[in-house]
Amino acid sequence: SEVEYRAEVGQNAYLPCFYTPAAPGNLVPVCWGKGACPVFECGNVVLRTDERDVNYWTSRYWLNGDFRKGDVSLTIENVTLADSGIYCCRIQIPGIMNDEKFNLKLVIKPAKVTPAPTRQRDFTAAFPRMLTTRGHGPAETQTLGSLPDINLTQISTLANELRDSRLANDLRDSGATIRIG
């Protein structure tokens, strides 16, 4: 059965997917689709990479990690209940029937708290994996760990730079990530 991941309405969801390039820079095409992995390709493609770059993505779906090192984990921005469902990460390894297919189930829960002011939502957007949870047990409440020293002026600048996956990755690893076991 699919591994289950959870996020709250209005937060960003994180669906992990990793592979190892056979040699540095020797990337493998990857597709992400909404719905279980079919026999070939991905259905309802939301993002795709080729041997060099991300060559297709749709609004709200992007790669936060360093995909050149095999981190093709999907971030879905500002999720709604409609984002619930199964997602397919397909690693298109050359060779007959060599594709690796991972079905990940995303469960979206209603937000527990009232929406924060816009500026604060920008801050949350700067840490895309925040509050994404995984597991089959009951959801847990968890407080955020220590966040980097960032003022509100910097936040608006950061928001414009989020598409730079290296920056986003550094932000993720600075202590802002929360994932419940």
Epitope: V3, P16, F18, K69, M97, N98, K101, R172
Partner: antibody, heavy 118, light 107 residues
């Protein structure tokens, strides 16, 4: 529940050969890359071999390249490791491991012991 | 090859202590990192992926962090059941390489 059960470990003389098997259940074996990892007596872990889901791509570290061969039978849900020209330094507990979206060794079997000694 | 230098190789701590261990990737390489826990007589178990994301069922006293090429595993309040050997693994490059392990004992 993912289950990986290794077998075939034995005492073998240097220069000898041995074939290990790993019976898999609880997941769709044919869509997952699989690996062998060994743990030598001082408890260090060393990657031994990886095979793609369809079986046509294989990867090895230099320490076993040319001596070990990883293969799979997707119809039987079984992974294999053929070991030849065995050396005393190949003595180890051999684990088979399944990859997942989280990395190459997300699930491990219980291991099978290979001892290479005269 | 990317070497993973893990330290310390062993440590002894008391119940309730904060415990940390580190892995450093050689060659200044930033890598995708997993942490594993291995209890005596058992096979390794995945604890953390992506350098800082806990697996299902792993107690919240465990945490991972990354600073450049240095990776740290922290146990915030040591419990008896945490007595084990801990390994890191880099899986960005072939060959896959593990750290040498940190054997954690309870005083």
């Amino acid at each position: 529940e993912v289950q990986l059960v290794e077998s075939g470990g034995d005492l073998v003389k240097p220069g000898g050969s041995l074939k290990l098997s790993c019976a898999a259940s609880g997941f769709t074996f044919s869509t997952n890359g699989m690996s062998w990892v060994r743990q030598i007596p001082d408890k260090r872990l060393e990657w031994v071999a990886t095979i793609s889901s369809g079986g046509s791509n294989t990867y090895y570290p230099d320490s076993v390249k040319g001596r070990f061969t990883i293969s799979r039978d997707n119809a039987k849900n079984t992974l294999y490791l053929q070991m030849s020209s065995l050396k005393s330094e190949d003595t180890a507990m051999y684990y088979c491991a399944r990859r997942s979206e989280l990395g190459p060794f997300a699930y491990w079997g219980q291991g099978t012991l290979v001892t290479v000694s005269a | 090859d990317v070497q993973m230098i893990q330290s310390p190789s062993s440590l002894s701590a008391s119940l309730g202590d904060i415990v940390t261990m580190t892995c450093q990737a050689s060659q200044g390489s930033s890598v995708n990192l997993n942490w594993f826990q291995q209890k005596p007589g058992k096979s390794p178990k995945l604890l953390i992926h992506g350098s800082n994301i806990l697996e299902d069922g792993v107690p919240s006293r465990f945490s991972g962090s990354r600073y450049g090429t240095d990776f740290t595993l922290t146990i915030s309040s040591l419990e008896n059941e945490d007595m084990a050997t801990y390994f890191c693994l880099q899986h960005s490059y072939l060959p896959y390489t593990f750290g040498g392990g940190t054997k954690l004992e309870i005083k």
